[in-house]
């Protein structure tokens, strides 16, 4: 049996997909089915993640990399590496302990996940409400009332109608 690797630390050259037992002469062993080692020199192979139930397989496990899961339709991932699946709600709703509930007046959610958030308070920025908010959409803030006075520069002011005999101020 021939090994083609260098003679330094015996474990360092055990490739990904194998594990190393430095108590034995024959050092590298292949990972058994449904296990993996993603780096060389590992002392054990890790059991592949299984995407079951509400999880579905996004990427199959291999001897050198773990499986990756996502969520079945109607659910979305939460946490690092999709460690949890949470039920989707409709836009305009949020998930509570009792299921999906419509956003209260004055709040909105434009996604299938997350919580309802308060509409933007346009007046805090000295602006006025251009488009009213809904359960699914935030308000759209427009220019402040002062911005709409004649002569003031504004993002989208309509051109003031001129009265005969008057010149622009």
């Amino acid at each position: 049996f021939e090994r083609t690797r260098s003679l330094q630390d015996p474990c360092s050259n055990c490739p990904a997909g194998t594990f190393c037992d430095n108590n034995r002469n024959q050092i590298c062993s292949p990972c058994p089915p449904n296990s993996f080692s993603s780096a060389g020199g590992q002392r054990t192979c890790d059991i592949c993640r299984q995407c079951k139930g509400v999880f579905r397989t996004r990427k199959e496990c291999s001897s050198t990399s773990n499986a990756e899961c996502d969520c079945t339709p109607g659910f979305h991932c939460l946490g690092a590496g999709c460690s949890m699946c949470e039920q989707d709600c409709k836009q305009g709703q949020e998930l509570t302990k009792k299921g999906c509930k419509d956003c209260c007046f004055g709040t909105f959610n434009d996604q299938k996940r997350g919580i309802c958030r308060p509409w933007t308070n346009c007046s805090l920025d000295g602006k006025s409400v251009l488009v009213n908010g809904t359960k699914e959409r935030d308000v759209v803030c427009g220019p402040s009332p002062a911005d709409l006075s004649p002569g003031a520069s504004s993002v989208t002011p309509p051109a003031p109608a001129r009265e005969p005999g008057h010149s622009p101020q």
Partner: antibody, heavy 114, light 107 residues
Framework: EVQLVESGGGLVQPGGSLRLSCAAS????????MHWVRQAPGKGLEWVAY????????YYADSVKGRFTISRDNAKNSLYLQMNSLRAEDTAMYYC???????WGQGTLLTVSS | EIVMTQSPATLSLSPGERVTLSCKAS??????VSWYQQKPGQAPRLLIY???NRYTGVPARFSGSGSGTDFTLTISSVEPEDLAVYYC?????????FGGGTKLELK
């Protein structure tokens, strides 16, 4: 669906050379080490060679050391076995298998005879 | 190298019988033993890995046990399609080695 398809077998005279190929599909070939295993007619299974996923680590059985060379082309999802100085005792069905040894191809038959 | 020895070489039985196949390793191989089924003209098929884990799609009548040097494959109730040669193999260390096989045939 995982598939491994061997090709390249045939009749060769003693001392001759041949290259076997294994075409892989249905899985991420570049993430798996690969084996060649052979089976002489009416006999048991004999492991021949292993190559790691990236090709950096290679092991051979003593019976083929110095005569056979295992290699792979991850861009082509292909595994190879170059066989030189062939002997009658190399006559066998040659299988490729993933390093989990869970999926095997259907094999390609090598016959070494004069 | 690690030598895997299977017994018996041949087993004659009737459908519905319980059958136990034996595999012994020449040295400790932990639980790194797999069992394969091979029918005439076909490639080997993985049944059991890690001594006792049934591979995907393998019927529940197949089970494996053992660790160290002694391993067993049990078929709880043999079906006609189970008639084949069964090999054990170790992946504890290179070179990977296999037993000589046990042939299951009809009485």
């Amino acid at each position: 669906e995982v598939q491994l398809v061997e090709s390249g077998g045939g009749l060769v005279q003693p001392g001759g050379s041949l290259r076997l190929s294994c075409a892989a599909s249905g899985f991420t070939f570049s993430e798996f080490g690969m084996h060649w295993v052979r089976q002489a007619p009416g006999k048991g299974l004999e492991w021949v060679a292993y190559i790691s996923s990236g090709g950096s680590t290679i092991y051979y059985a003593d019976s083929v050391k110095g005569r056979f060379t295992i290699s792979r082309d991850n861009a082509k999802n292909s595994l190879y076995l170059q066989m030189n100085s062939l002997r009658a005792e190399d006559t066998a069905m040659y299988y490729c298998a993933r390093d989990w040894v869970d999926y095997w191809g259907q094999g390609t038959l090598l016959t070494v005879s004069s | 190298e690690i030598v895997m020895t299977q017994s018996p070489a041949t087993l004659s039985l009737s459908p519905g019988e319980r059958v136990t196949l034996s595999c012994k390793a020449s040295e400790n191989v932990g639980s790194y033993v797999s069992w394969y089924q091979q029918k005439p003209g076909q490639a080997p098929r993985l049944l059991i890995y890690g001594a006792s884990n049934r591979y995907t799609g393998v019927p529940a009548r197949f089970s494996g046990s053992g660790s160290g040097t002694d391993f067993t494959l049990t078929i709880s109730s043999v079906e006609p399609e189970d008639l084949a040669v069964y090999y054990c193999g170790q992946s504890y260390s290179y070179p990977l080695t296999f037993g000589g096989g046990t042939k299951l045939e009809l009485k």
